[in-house]
């Protein structure tokens, strides 16, 4: 909707546009209107943009009016929430951004016979984007002055410059999203797609064989399994097999059959043939044993002569019997095949906790260190093994020994260094234990056997320029005299770094201070205050462009200050009656010389060249293949002699043509076989060999025999706003903006208020390549000086 709010009205005399009084008669004496005030109300008409506004015609975007909201003069700026002074024009179409607005102030006659009369009317054509911010407009000419504000706001869920982009947040089957400030859908966590209705599956879930209805899930398609649905399910019952696709059963080595359950190498897997029989695989799960002499049976398990196989182990002798065989065992062995060692450790004969080890037909005692002998019954001499490490002597005792330790050592073997560190080291020093002694390792700044002494770091007089040295732990500090700094007072302080002087004043460094030499108009320690010239010297108005003031800077004792109303491109010329005109520099025009004259108006650039306006000058950016100040010269593309093998060159626009001889082909007569190579067509064009010629198929934005000429299409229609010049750049374009405009398509108004041209707290109003200063009370002039 388009909203307009009346802010104030000033109709000092209570007059109508036609000069009559709202309330009837004038006072014959002072010619002021008498009787009652105007009964003011407003009418609004909103229509399509008109560069030359016409009062008639339909209000195609809507119209409306307020009730009577005041008399001659009123101010409604403070009355927020009062809808009487507001007109709302809803629109059900895309907002076109540009518009023309007619606002009329009317006097209500309050009777049916007399028609209402118009007080004042304002028209405004412009461009406004939807925003919550109000834009204030003023009508400052004619009998009445009034101020109003306008804005365009989009309905809920509508966005964009045209309020025609719809976005309503939702979290249901059809989508899971919020809307950003531009009306774009922003998917909730776990959702994706243009409508945010596609769940993002578990990270790693196979995009081919897995899917999900809920974010984070991973459901496998039929025939697939595993954490990420990337493992196929083999055929049910598949034993020694794998799959690459679902329901396969691809057998591992040595397995066969439909379910890979048939052993093709039964011999290797089971080794069924005994007694040296040779195994042969005869089929899946089948084998045959060929037995050595004296053995038979499917696995060669039957011995035809029982003693042939040497069944009696450990030198036992074999005797064949009716039941097979019988073994007679050698000493220390027992069992049917003499394979069991008789336990000679039962009972245990080892004394003093010795461990008995069974041998064949005997035993051995493993004695504890203090005992020796066949059954550990003898006392061992432990001193023979030299167990004492740091000792004067070793004494053998029964089942033990004694070491007489050297000073500083202890423990059974005198191998433990006695810790002599008992807190003797001071000032957090660490103690290193030595043999029968210790050493203190001092932290920085301390010395002495026990680190009890603080080292004096000031002893070497490190402070310069009369600095006083203060000793601290492991460091010193220099207290510097005035004018010096640095850890050793080695730096002479430069009070001018950084420069404290403002408004271009020169800074002078002193021993302990600085001095600012202020320019004429400034004063104060840092030259930060504007001199109030009128406090000391009265100003004399010479004419509407100049004032004079007393000054000791000039020989005459008078300084003339010129007005800068004509800006940087003009000089002020005084006229009679307090008026002035601006004498513009070459290349500029307009009331305040703020408009750069368009030197391109005469279209001086030829052959498709683009004209860029300068100050009292212009520059031609030539189309490909042209040069010269006016793009009047066709560049000679034959100058580099591009035609090989005797070919004759003919210059074209941004191109050349080679007339080839003796069967040579191609763009430069370089080939015997083909008309095309990678350099034939420019700018990404595709080359086709057509026998005796070549043809280039050009990408968008390019044309010509070798795609060498940029089409103007990227500049048609002109994408550059506000009088900007479009320069073709292949498939793209560049805008050269007029003064006062910037941005890729010259759509942004340059901030002419930067940097702060208005003095003395004046407020700057930015226009299109101009600014205006609204001065604080007590100040005047174009820049409130």
């Amino acid at each position: 909707q388009f909203e307009l709010e009346i802010l104030s009205m000033q109709n000092v005399n209570g007059e109508l546009q036609n000069g009559n009084c709202c309330g009837g008669a004038r006072n014959p004496g002072d010619r002021k209107c008498t009787r009652d005030e105007c009964d003011t109300y407003f009418k609004v008409c909103l229509k399509e943009y008109q560069s030359r506004v016409t009062a008639g015609g339909p209000c195609s975007f809507g119209s409306g009016s307020t009730p009577v909201i005041g008399g001659n003069t009123f101010n409604l700026k403070a009355s927020r929430g009062n809808d009487r002074n507001r007109i709302v024009l809803p629109f059900s179409f895309a907002w076109p951004r540009s518009y023309t607005l007619l606002v009329e102030a009317w006097d209500s006659s309050n009777d049916t016979v007399q028609p209402d009369s118009i007080i004042e009317k304002a028209s405004h054509s412009g461009m406004i984007n939807p925003s919550r911010q109000w834009q204030t407009l003023k009508q400052n000419t004619g009998v009445a002055h009034f101020e109003y504000q306008i804005r365009v706001t989009c309905d809920d869920y509508y966005y964009g410059f045209g309020c025609n982009k719809f976005c309503r947040p939702r979290d249901d089957f059809f989508g899971h999203y919020a809307c950003d400030q531009n009306g774009n859908k922003t998917c909730m966590e776990g959702w994706m797609g243009p409508e945010c209705n596609r769940a993002i599956c578990r990270q790693g879930c196979s995009p081919k064989h897995g899917s999900c209805k809920l974010p984070g899930d991973c459901r496998c398609q039929y025939g697939w399994q595993g954490l990420y649905c990337d493992k196929c399910i083999p055929h049910p019952g598949c034993v020694h097999g794998i799959c690459n696709e679902p329901w396969q059963c691809l057998c591992e080595t040595n397995w066969g059959g439909q379910l890979c359950d048939k052993d093709l190498n039964y011999c290797g897997t089971h080794q069924p043939c005994l007694n040296g029989g040779t195994c042969s695989n005869t089929g899946p799960d089948k084998y045959q044993c060929s037995c050595p002499e004296g053995y038979s049976g499917p696995n060669c398990e039957i011995a035809e002569h029982a003693c042939l196989s040497d069944p009696c182990h450990n030198r036992g002798s074999c005797k064949e019997t009716s039941l097979g065989f019988e073994c007679e065992c050698s000493p220390g062995w027992t069992g049917p095949t003499c394979s069991t060692n008789i336990d000679d450790c039962s009972p245990n004969n080892c004394s003093h906790g010795g461990t008995c080890q069974d041998l064949v037909n005997g035993f051995k005692c493993v004695c504890p260190p203090q005992w020796t002998g066949k059954t550990c019954q003898l006392d061992a001499n432990e001193c023979e093994a030299k167990p004492c490490v740091n000792a004067k002597s070793c004494k053998n005792l029964i089942a033990s020994y004694y070491c007489d330790c050297l000073p500083g050592w202890m423990g059974q073997n005198c191998d433990i260094n006695i810790n002599d560190c008992l807190g003797q080291c001071q000032n957090d020093a660490s103690c290193r234990d030595l043999v029968n002694g210790y050493r203190c390792i001092c932290p920085p700044g301390y010395a002495g056997d026990h680190c009890e002494r603080d080292i004096d770091e000031c002893a070497s007089n490190p402070c310069l320029n009369g600095g006083h040295c203060q000793n601290e732990i492991n460091r010193f500090q220099c207290l510097c005299p005035t004018g010096f700094s640095g850890n050793l007072c080695q730096l002479d302080i430069d009070y001018c770094e950084p420069n404290p002087c403002q408004n271009g004043a020169q800074c002078y460094n002193r021993a302990s201070d600085y001095f600012c030499k202020c320019p004429e108009d400034y004063e104060g320690k840092n030259c930060s205050h504007l001199k109030d010239h009128c406090r000391t010297t009265p100003c004399e108005v010479i004419d509407s462009c100049t004032v004079a003031m007393a000054s000791n800077d000039t020989p005459e004792g008078v300084r003339y200050i010129s007005s800068n109303v004509c800006g940087p491109h003009g000089k002020c010329k005084s006229q009679s009656g307090g008026k002035f005109t601006c004498d513009c520099n070459k290349g500029f025009t307009g009331t305040y010389c703020h408009e750069n004259i368009n030197d391109c108006e005469s279209n001086p650039c030829r052959n498709g060249g683009t004209c860029i306006d300068g100050v009292n000058s212009y520059k031609c950016i030539c189309s490909d293949g042209w040069e010269g100040a006016y793009c009047e010269t066709n560049i000679n593309d034959c100058s580099q002699n591009p035609c090989h093998n005797g070919g004759t060159c003919r210059d074209l626009v941004n191109d050349f043509y080679c007339d080839c001889k003796n069967g040579w082909k191609g763009k430069t007569c370089h080939s015997r076989d083909s008309q095309c190579d990678e350099a034939t067509c420019n700018n990404g064009g595709t080359c086709y060999d057509e026998g005796d010629a070549f043809k280039c198929m050009c990408p968008g934005g390019w044309e010509g025999t070798t795609c060498n000429i940029a089409r103007n299409s990227s500049c048609l229609p002109n994408p550059c706003h506000n009088g900007g010049t479009c320069v073709v750049n292949g498939e793209s374009f560049t805008c050269v903006c007029k003064e006062g405009w910037e941005g890729p398509i010259c759509a942004q108004n340059t901030n002419d208020c930067s940097p702060h041209p208005c003095y003395n707290s004046g407020t700057c109003v930015d226009g299109d390549n101009w600014y205006r200063c609204e001065c604080a009370p007590g100040f005047a002039g174009p820049d409130c000086r």
Epitope: E189, G190, I200, C201, R202, Q203, G204, S206, L214, P215, G216, D217, C218, R219, G226, L227, Y228, D230, K231
Partner: antibody
């Protein structure tokens, strides 16, 4: 800030059923996360038991599959673990942990754990 | 099951010195999406494990930059550039490429 808190009896008889509950705060168990149980026998390493998603999709460690059930109570925002035919080998600290389905970090939040002893 | 093998099983390091733990898997942990699903956790005494590194080399939020991970396929390393007292505990690697998820036996880090 998501928080997980395990609770349940600290002592279970052999051949009985071990039952634990994990209460989640700061996140919904119906979010895009998987919720796992992991256990750690005293002085030993970590063993993954199984996981559940939205109360309907479960995966279990094959070594425990025949004895384990993981379920959810959406109204209480809780995950439960049931382990039948408990033996002394099931004595461990049991942790519940969040395992994001979306995002690269796995097992990014854990409960403090609860010790369960299987003994008569 | 994929077997994760860590070396060494214990480590004693002086504060300020570097430390390195190796983890080998019995199968490649490289997924078809190009990511490698190997994770490192630290379990401080009396606490649950906490995530340090995800997908081989990415530090989880709040993890100091002295921790770094590297490796590919089946061989991975966790490095601590300068060990601090608060780094003591048991470090575990874990694979997330296949069921069941499996952890290494753990490496106990102590301060000398």
């Amino acid at each position: 800030q998501v928080q997980l808190q395990e609770s349940g009896p600290g002592l279970v008889k052999p051949s009985g059923t071990l039952s634990l509950t994990c209460t989640v705060s700061g996140d919904s168990i119906s979010s895009s996360n998987w919720w796992s149980w992991v256990r750690q026998p005293p002085g030993q390493g970590l063993e993954w038991i199984g996981e559940i998603f939205h109360g309907e999709n479960t995966n279990y460690n094959p070594s425990l599959k025949s004895r384990v059930t993981i379920s959810v109570d959406k109204s209480k925002n809780q995950i439960s673990l049931n382990l039948t035919s408990a033996t002394a080998a099931d004595t461990a600290v049991y942790y519940c942990a969040r395992n994001p389905g979306i995002g690269a970090a796995k097992f990014d939040s854990w409960g403090q754990g609860t010790l369960v002893t299987v003994s008569s | 099951d994929i077997v994760m093998t860590q070396t060494p099983l214990s480590l004693s390091v002086t504060p300020g010195q570097p430390a390195s733990i190796s983890c080998k898997s019995s199968q490649s942990l490289l997924h078809s999406d190009g990511k490698t699903y190997l994770y490192w956790y630290l379990q401080k005494p009396g606490q649950p494990p906490q995530l340090l590194i995800y997908e081989v080399s990415n530090r989880f939020s709040g993890v100091p930059d002295r921790f770094s991970g590297s490796g590919s396929g089946t061989d991975f390393t966790l490095k601590i550039s300068r060990v601090e007292a608060e780094d003591v505990g048991v470090y575990y690697c874990m694979q997330h490429i296949d069921f069941p998820f499996t952890f290494g036996q753990g490496t106990k880090l102590e301060i000398k």
